[in-house]
């Protein structure tokens, strides 16, 4: 089969091969496509409500006035020539539609170094295939799930019109020290091939370096971290930052189900007691900061103290959360 | 039901004392942490001291060292001794309950019971 495609809402004239130019003729067309069930036979008497969507011309060539998404399908012409010699045409047609110049909404004047920030969302109305979204930065292409950047897609189709809108969420987590501004831009690549990309007009956030905060300092009481079964343990957590960030709890890596508060206290410590503790101090403007980690243990009688529990870990600073 | 009743609110000058008492009654005293929360004006309820099992104890790092918690298990009291007071210890102090934890934080939205409150005030 021949491939064709037609853009929406244009005509279209597929010729019958072999088909005298003029009646008397001996042919037939054949579609199945989105408006038939099964297979529809035209033929050149026409009449009747298929001439407004596919009537046979005098030539023996069919013309489609406005080719439609429901005109996709297998086109098929059977003629015989004067002398009987039968020839069979057969097309297969696509059709698409080409949408507006896509356009970048809800775009960020400033993206935060070291944290994930939204780009902005490129949006794309009236397109058919669905066709796809892509982005760049700096011109090149950015790759979802690579060096902190995340994409979340959507496609809707309109219901009357069968048309696609395409939605391109753009996460991005900047390098610290990176471009101060990036280009970012999106285009449309048509469903359909020899169809050009669509860009968007580039936007240039600004990129915002925190200043590294002071750290969070996690004190325990007893010092060292290691207290005889049924004593206590306070956890205090220390944020020079005004006004007061929120502060959580983890154990072992695992957010504890207690509210805000700098201080933890382990009243009564049992085996159940015994891991790993960080605080997670939450700034308004920063975004989340992890203390050190501080390995609370139980000495039984007669060992020593500080050596049973050691007071360290990986001080993983303002993007632990990030 | 579980009843907190404080007393022993008052007004006094600058480096004076108070006793504050809170009686408890429908808890099982000994197994609960027992705690004075303090509100001032527009400011946040903030926990001040907490007891709990033996002489377990907790204090608000301002207060170390001027207020004293204690409890008597068989009366089913506790008690806030208050010393060296300054006006920026002016405020309603609450006595407040909690069923014996696992972990205890200073949030106000970890204790179950709470008292009435008394006024402490101090003058400069």
């Known amino acids: 089969a021949q491939n064709i495609t037609a853009r929406i809402g244009e005509p279209l004239v597929l010729k019958c091969k072999g088909a005298p130019k003029k009646p008397p003729q001996r042919l037939e067309w054949k579609l199945n496509t989105g408006r038939t069930e099964a297979w529809k036979v035209l033929s050149p008497q026409g009449g009747g409500p298929w001439d407004s969507v596919a009537r046979v011309l005098p030539n023996g060539s069919l013309f489609l006035p406005a080719v439609g998404i429901q005109d996709e399908g297998i086109f098929r012409c059977q003629a015989m020539n004067r002398n009987g010699k039968e020839t069979k045409s057969n097309y297969r047609v696509r059709v698409y539609q080409i949408p507006g110049k896509p356009e970048i909404v809800d775009s960020a004047s400033e993206l935060t170094a070291g944290v994930p920030n939204k780009v902005g969302t490129c949006v794309s109305e009236g397109s058919y295939p669905a066709g796809t979204l892509s982005w760049h930065l700096d011109g090149k292409p950015l790759v979802p799930n690579e060096k902190g950047v995340s994409v979340k897609e959507q496609t809707r189709r309109h219901p009357e019109t069968g048309l696609f809108t395409l939605q391109s969420e753009l996460m991005v987590t900047p390098a610290r020290g990176g471009d101060p501004r990036p280009t970012f831009s999106c285009s449309f690549s048509p469903g359909l091939p020899r169809h050009r990309a669509l860009r968007t007009a580039p936007i240039q956030p600004r990129v915002w370096e925190p200043v590294p905060l002071e750290e969070v300092q996690l004190v325990v009481e007893p010092e060292g971290g290691a207290v005889a079964p049924g004593g206590t343990v306070t956890l205090t957590c220390e944020v020079p930052a005004q006004p007061s960030p929120q502060i959580h709890w983890m154990k072992d890596g695992v957010p504890l189900p207690l509210p805000p508060s700098p201080v933890l206290i382990l009243p009564e410590i049992g085996p159940q007691d015994q891991g790993t503790y960080s605080c997670v101090a939450t700034h308004s403007s920063h975004g989340p900061q992890e203390s050190r980690a501080v390995s609370i243990s139980i000495i039984e009688p007669g060992e020593e103290g500080p050596t049973a529990g050691s007071v360290g870990g990986s001080g993983l600073g303002t993007l632990a959360l990030a | 039901a579980v009843q907190l009743v404080e007393s022993g609110g008052g007004s006094v000058e600058a480096g004076g004392s108070l006793r504050l008492s809170c009686a408890a009654a429908?808890?099982?005293?000994?197994?609960?942490?027992l705690a004075w929360f303090r509100q001032a004006p527009g400011k946040e309820r903030e926990l001040v001291s907490a007891s709990w099992r033996g002489d377990s104890t907790y204090y608000l790092p301002s207060v170390k060292g001027r207020f004293t918690i204690s409890r008597d298990n068989a009366k089913n009291m506790v008690y806030l001794q208050m010393n060296d007071l300054k006006p920026e210890d002016t405020a309603v102090y609450i006595c407040?309950?909690?069923?014996?934890?696992?972990?205890?934080?200073?949030?106000?939205?970890?204790?179950?019971?709470w008292g009435q409150g008394t006024q402490v005030t101090v003058s400069s």
């Open positions: 429908g808890i099982a005293f000994s197994s609960y942490i």
């Open positions: 407040a309950a909690k069923e014996f934890p696992r972990w205890l934080t200073l949030s106000p939205l970890d204790y179950d019971h």
